[in-house]
């Protein structure tokens, strides 16, 4: 990636890291308003299976692993990217390495959920306070989950699907920060590990993933009012280990693995028309990216 100053533009979709033949250090940003991609400063260490989030206008890359010809190292790292300076800086590491992690943000705090370290599949969850540069463990999930999808709705943290070390999961659970406790919610219609999970219009969406046999293109959403999961239009491509984010009322899914190919495809979901469309391609195919959108 280039080391010059990043252009000072509005909301961009950032994609960090990923995997194609080995873990990647790319940081790229897509501008949906003009369809362009920016090549930004590389991660200091390549990683896949990471998660991305934005707090206070800064992009954070959380966990993952560096799968390279030199070896395979699960990551406990938290790194912070400043779009104004186009530079990465390390923050305090998590208590344990977490590959195929899920993250969510509540009240400016980053929650790191599940993931794996070698053969250990975590149910542990920890919270990062940026102002103190500190991590603290909170209540563990009821289920061990890697490849877990995480989303925040109404200041509640949802952990959806994943893999517990033996089985891929359709179960989901919700964390209540005030009570520091997890409760199960209605299970999805479909087993999904490595799905893309996000929030749009008071619903939690779970897109794609892997059911233990095949990659999926199906998409379902959870209505917190009715506590039910309902299918919406499927994506054009089957994909697991995909990136997902929401930009201006639309869902974007990036890359992933379809069982044969590492996808460069980026699809966009319009909830008004219940349709998916191909909007762009990443500069190369990859799975296991971390994705987030800058704030205004």
């Amino acid at each position: 990636g280039s080391m010059g100053h990043a252009p000072k533009v509005g909301r961009l979709i950032y994609t960090a890291g990923g995997y194609f033949r080995q873990s990647l250090s790319y940081l790229e940003a897509y501008n949906p308003s003009d369809g362009t991609w920016l090549d930004l400063a590389d991660l200091q260490v390549p990683r896949s299976g990471l998660a991305g989030c934005v707090v206070g206008g800064l992009l954070y890359a959380v966990g993952g692993r560096n799968n390279s010809p030199d070896g395979n190292t699960d990551s406990s790292a938290l790194d912070c990217y400043n779009p104004m300076t186009n530079q990465w800086s390390p923050c305090a590491p998590m208590s344990v390495p977490r590959n195929r992690i899920g993250v969510g943000v509540i009240d400016g705090h980053i929650y790191a959920v599940g993931g794996s370290h070698g053969c250990i599949h975590h149910n542990s969850v920890e919270r990062y306070e940026p102002e103190r540069d500190e991590w603290h463990l909170v209540a563990p999930m009821l289920t061990r989950r890697i490849g877990v999808g995480v989303a925040v709705l109404n200041r509640l943290l949802y952990a959806v699907g994943g893999f517990d070390g033996t089985n891929r999961l359709n179960s989901a659970e919700c964390y209540y920060p005030e009570r520091n406790e997890w409760r199960m919610i209605t299970a999805m219609n479909t087993i999904r590990s490595g799905a893309g999970v996000c929030v749009l219009h008071n619903c939690i969406y779970a897109a794609g993933g892997y059911d233990g046999q095949d990659q999926l293109n199906s998409v379902e959403r959870y209505d917190v009012e009715t506590e039910t999961w309902t299918f919406v239009a499927p994506m054009k491509h089957r994909r697991s280990a995909l990136g997902i984010t929401v930009h201006q009322g639309r869902i974007y899914v990036l890359g992933g693995y379809d069982g044969h190919t590492f996808l460069d495809s980026v699809e966009c979901y319009d909830p008004d028309t219940d349709t998916w469309s191909e909007v762009t391609r990443m500069t190369s195919g990859r799975s296991g990216v971390g994705v987030a959108v800058t704030m205004e």
């Epitope: 799968n67 195929r100 250990i120 070390g165 046999q213 693995y257």
Partner: antibody, heavy 119, light 107 residues
């Protein structure tokens, strides 16, 4: 019945290439990680490579990284090991194995195929 | 890489004997250890996973145990078909590694 059948072994000169195949039946390779494990004559077992069906990620032993490539074709229910820049120390019986429901334990193995690297 | 040191490298025993094979990990591997049996010219067969869980279809005379970083495979009453080479394997961290093997021979 779960079965794995390797093929493609043989005699090759140092620096040469071979492609091993592992044909699966009785289960879908899209549902399991597939590994290659080798055994030099009269020696013990050495893990070589694996491919994850969910993420597509591959892992390699340091001794073969950059020279060997594992892949899978789910439509043929077959896994492959492309071996380039072969060395005398790569001489071994190569087994493909299925990862069971427990991380990196192998609950089904092929019969093996012998690769001999010699001039 | 984690080393799995297996002992003894070979042993002689009679049918009906109780046989114990040990494997010591060079660092903690939790319970992520498996045991395999291999006969000449054949592929290995899984006996034990997660240090002490008996794999489906394996006779109950085989058992596994863990004490810290020491792992033990026990055959309670050796049968004629049990003469073979046995390997331990750790899958706790990358790369997965095997012990050097223990050959169980007829006395």
């Amino acid at each position: 019945e779960v079965q794995l059948v390797e093929s493609g072994g043989g005699l090759v000169q140092p620096g040469g290439s071979l492609r091993l195949s592992c044909a699966a039946s009785g289960f879908a390779i899209s549902a399991s990680s597939i590994h290659w494990v080798r055994q030099a004559p009269g020696k013990g077992l050495e893990w070589v490579a694996s491919i994850d069906p969910e993420t597509g990620e591959t892992l390699y032993a340091k001794s073969v990284a950059g020279r060997f490539t594992i892949s899978a074709d789910t439509s043929k229910n077959t896994a492959y090991l492309q071996m380039n820049s072969l060395r005398a120390e790569d001489t071994a019986v190569y087994y493909c194995a299925r990862e069971g429901k427990w991380w990196a334990y192998f609950d089904a193995w092929g019969q093996g195929t012998l690769v001999t690297v010699s001039s | 890489d984690i080393q799995m040191t297996q002992s003894p490298s070979s042993l002689s025993a009679s049918v009906g004997d109780r046989v114990t094979i040990t494997c010591r990990a060079s660092q903690s591997v939790s319970s992520a250890v498996a045991w395999y049996q291999q006969k000449p010219g054949k592929a290995p067969k899984l006996l034990i996973y997660s240090a002490s869980s008996l794999y489906s279809g394996v006779p109950s005379r085989f058992s596994g145990s863990r004490s810290g970083t020491d792992f033990t495979l026990t055959i309670s009453s050796l049968q004629p078909e049990d003469f073979a080479t046995y390997y331990c394997q750790q899958s706790y961290s990358f790369p997965s590694t095997f012990g050097q093997g223990t050959k169980v021979e007829i006395k």
